[in-house]
């Protein structure tokens, strides 16, 4: 039950996280104009990974896409790549994890296969979350660097009474969404990996063999043998729920859907 809950919760947390990563990637407010020097601006600038926008106090907002690839900073391209990789891995992870969910039966899929799929999706979620966190952090670092650079030469033209104030940018909402979403995806991935350990068949009970001693019958049953493969694809390492001694010719029954509660 705990395994199913952990797996289900991991899936839901990852789903929310990946939705957040997608939202953050699409958001325009990765960087927003710093209003410290001019809190009463009539023009507010903000930028995303794909376009930059200007919101006027009149109520009009004008957005322009970055219609160039070569002209964009390498760091921005790197952030885009990290976010897209994060989304793709997350999406594949979600697809895999749907089939790995314990509460969903797909044909005669064995638990070892589900365990493998759970681990795979968990790792994908972890990498996806790390990609998002890395992407957002790279962008944030870029902002901090540019912020202090523009602060150093805040007033570029001081000829006479004329001032040319450089626009500085600070953290936008998308960064916080990205960090939280990346963290959730990462946590979801870890939960899936933990659930995978619980899903993996850990013990193999050999078929009980009856030894007939003279005079009275004693059933000998060898102790449980720890499976060395953990959650490998060894289908022979199946748990046998035997109520007592069995004969040599008794057929081993595979676990039914009621065997794991």
């Amino acid at each position: 039950m705990a395994v199913t809950a952990c797996q289900g919760l991991g899936f839901v947390v990852s789903l929310i996280g990946i939705a957040g990563i997608i939202a953050a990637t699409c958001m325009d407010q990765w960087s927003t104009q710093d209003l410290y020097n001019n809190p009463v601006t009539a023009v507010f600038n903000y930028q995303g990974l794909w376009r930059s926008c200007v919101r006027e106090s009149s109520g009009f907002t004008e957005c322009r896409g970055y219609f160039t690839l070569l002209g964009l900073p390498a760091m921005l391209q790197a952030v885009r790549a990290l976010m897209i990789v994060g989304i793709v891995l997350g999406a594949i992870g979600l697809l895999v994890s749907i089939f790995a969910l314990k509460c969903i039966r797909i044909g005669s899929m064995e638990d070892s296969a589900k365990a493998n799929m759970t681990l795979t999706s968990g790792i994908m979620f972890i990498v996806s979350g790390l990609c998002a966190i890395a992407g957002v952090s790279v962008f944030a670092n870029m902002l901090v660097t540019n912020f202090w650079m523009s602060t150093a030469n805040m007033y570029t033209g001081m000829g006479g009474m004329v001032q040319t104030v450089q626009t500085r940018y600070t953290f936008g909402a998308a960064l916080f969404v990205g960090w939280v979403a990346g963290g959730l995806t990462l946590i979801g991935g870890v939960m899936m990996c933990i659930a995978c350990r619980g899903l993996a068949p850990e013990e193999t009970n050999y078929k009980a063999v009856s030894y007939h001693a003279s005079g009275h019958s004693v059933a000998y049953k060898p102790g449980g043998f720890k499976a060395s493969t953990g959650f490998g694809s060894n289908t022979k390492n199946k748990k046998i729920y035997d109520g007592g001694a069995r004969t040599e010719d008794e057929v081993q029954s595979y676990p039914s859907k009621h065997d794991y509660v």
Epitope: N38, V43, N45, E56, F60, V165, T167
Partner: antibody, heavy 118, light 113 residues
Framework: EVQLVESGGGLVQPGGSLRLSCAAS????????MHWVRQAPGKGLEWVSY????????YYADSVKGRFTISRDNPKNSLYLQMNSLRAEDTAVYYC???????????WGQGTLVTVSS | DIVMTQSPSSLAVSLGERATINCKSS????????????LTWYQQKPGQPPKLLIY???TRESGVPDRFSGSGSGTDFTLTISSLQAEDVAVYYC?????????FGQGTKLEIK
Amino acid sequence: EVQLVESGGGLVQPGGSLRLSCAASGFTLNNFGMHWVRQAPGKGLEWVSYISSGSGTIYYADSVKGRFTISRDNPKNSLYLQMNSLRAEDTAVYYCARAYYGNAFSFWGQGTLVTVSS
Amino acid sequence: DIVMTQSPSSLAVSLGERATINCKSSQSLLNSGNQKNYLTWYQQKPGQPPKLLIYWASTRESGVPDRFSGSGSGTDFTLTISSLQAEDVAVYYCQNVYSYPLTFGQGTKLEIK
């Protein structure tokens, strides 16, 4: 046709109050930021106040801060300027104006004259 | 506050001649986000409210004759009337619409010589 019609002007004593109204027609007021601008007799234009489309952002000129209050009633398609503690230097024609692309004032009312005199 | 200074304060030009009005701001009105200058020009005739001529320093408002043009960037701007007509007699104002308070220039009175 877009129209802005101001009303509520008149003669008032120093220290008195007045409430100006601006009725909009031909467009939906709640899509635009709105301004009040005044012009003293024979003088230039002076911006007075601004209110954003959702009333979330409001600005005032230093000369009227603390005395004037801008507000709007979007369902009624109306803009208001409550003027308290009026002074002789507040005597002017008050215009309401609709903001446009580039923050420009694209449409202006005909204005209403406010005279502050004892 | 951004101070807007217009020159000249009055101008007399012959019909059909070019009229040029200058406007200088104490701070740059160029917005780096969209590379547009937040300066507007208005025309006000006696007894009438002002009329928008130019926004974004050089974009002509619809319905405004093409003899009116705006130019300039940063802190220095110009309104040009290529061929003065009798109906152009008015007071012209430039306005900072980049930062609050939205300040106006003192106005330039244009007359026919």
